[in-house]
């Protein structure tokens, strides 16, 4: 006999990185017939939704009208069908950005390199932070962490054409409060013809959620996006 229901998916629209004072919607998708959804933040109950009619709804939304550091952190959701509860969703890390200052991103030996060359990014921010984050544009929003008093190094090692793309960095005041993004740095990796033709910018995640983040920073608009649990492995 089943003791729990499958875990729901949780994600943020338009993006899990939210500029301060902008809006974001936390979505939780469970099953049709779920009579109650609960959103939890850092382990505490935050909000409850009882969709009507439950048999026609499998996704609920919780809305944050103006993002701030108190709303940034780890969210999860659960749902109930009858008396049976689901497993909790993966954790959604909701990050507030545009806090305080703007770091500077540079790349060594330069933005145009040959396949096989060793490349290092440097993110510098003079205010009180010791953690830095490097992100490559693309749907995966893969985050690398680096540490240093005012600057962090991000060695990419010998690069391939798969490393091509646009990078930005953030200073982090804590895990969920980040600085303004740096200006972008576009890394161009040239290689032999075979490699170049076979290496799209981000083969795993073609859709651009970074563009969505930028749209949020510039206009604060909401945009409908495909389901994406950024914490899913």
């Amino acid at each position: 006999q089943q003791q729990t229901l499958p875990k729901p998916f949780i994600w943020a629209e338009p993006h899990f990185m939210v500029p301060k004072e902008k809006q974001v919607t936390i979505c939780c998708q469970g099953n049709y017939g779920a009579v109650e959804y609960q959103l939890h933040f850092e382990g505490s109950l935050f909000a409850v939704d009882r969709p009507k009619p439950p048999e026609r709804i499998n996704k609920v939304q919780f809305y944050i009208p103006d993002m701030n550091s108190r709303m940034a952190g780890q969210y999860s959701c659960i749902y109930r069908v009858g008396e049976l509860w689901s497993e909790p969703s993966n954790l959604l890390d909701l990050v507030v950005t545009e806090m305080y200052d703007t770091p500077t991103l540079s790349v060594h030996p330069g933005p145009e390199v040959i396949s096989g060359e060793k490349v290092t990014f440097y993110c510098r921010l003079d205010t009180a932070t010791s953690m830095f984050l490097l992100l490559k544009e693309g749907r995966s929003s893969h985050v690398q962490r680096g540490y240093g008093k005012v600057q962090a190094e991000f060695p990419l090692g010998p690069v391939t054409t798969a490393h091509r793309g646009t990078y930005r960095c953030f200073g982090s005041y804590n895990n969920h409060a980040w600085s303004f993004p740096s200006e972008p740095v576009k890394l161009l990796v040239t290689g032999d013809i075979e490699n170049t033709s076979l290496a799209p910018e981000d083969p795993t995640f073609p859709a651009d959620t970074w563009g969505t983040y930028l749209l949020t920073t510039e206009t604060g608009l909401q945009k409908d996006h495909a389901l994406w649990d950024h914490t899913a492995q």
């Epitope: 939704d49 009882r50 809305y63 009208p65």
Partner: nanobody
Framework: QVQLVESGGGLVQAGGSLRLSCAAS????????MGWFRQAPGKEREFVAG????????YYADSVKGRFTISRDNAKNTVGLQMNSLKPEDTAVYYC????????????????????WGQGTQVTVSS
């Protein structure tokens, strides 16, 4: 902007009843999720009961479940809290709060998501 004014507090004996009312100004009242919180001396503010903007969904703290009932009248811009079988531990200042932007069936439990607050009304339950 919504302004909230609570009324109905007072002194009551244990086992008695009180009805709190919260009057809201603002034409968009019907689009706000509403809640009642309380704060006893020397304690943190705690959630008591919440209601979605449609009035279809309610949620209660375990400590008041079965004794308190939250309701709303969107035509009159009011939210009520009927409190029965009162206990001395219910003694506190009771606050009404409004949260904007949620869909019609969402009940907000955390005080972080409530944007507007009343000044509070004192409820004292004597033994």
């Amino acid at each position: 902007q919504v302004q909230l004014v609570e009324s109905g507090g007072g002194l009551v004996q244990a086992g008695g009843s009180l009805r709190l009312s919260c009057a809201a100004s603002g034409r968009t009242f019907s689009s706000y999720a509403m809640g009642w919180f309380r704060q006893a001396p020397g304690k943190e503010r705690e959630f008591v009961a919440g209601i979605s903007w449609s009035g279809d969904s309610t949620y209660y703290a375990d400590s008041v479940k079965g004794r308190f009932t939250i309701s709303r009248d969107n035509a009159k811009n009011t939210v009520g809290l009927q409190m029965n079988s009162l206990k001395p531990e219910d003694t506190a200042v009771y606050y009404c709060a409004a949260a904007s932007g949620q869909v019609q069936t969402v009940v907000v439990v955390t005080d972080r998501w409530y944007h507007y607050w009343g000044q509070g009304t004192q409820v004292t339950v004597s033994s």
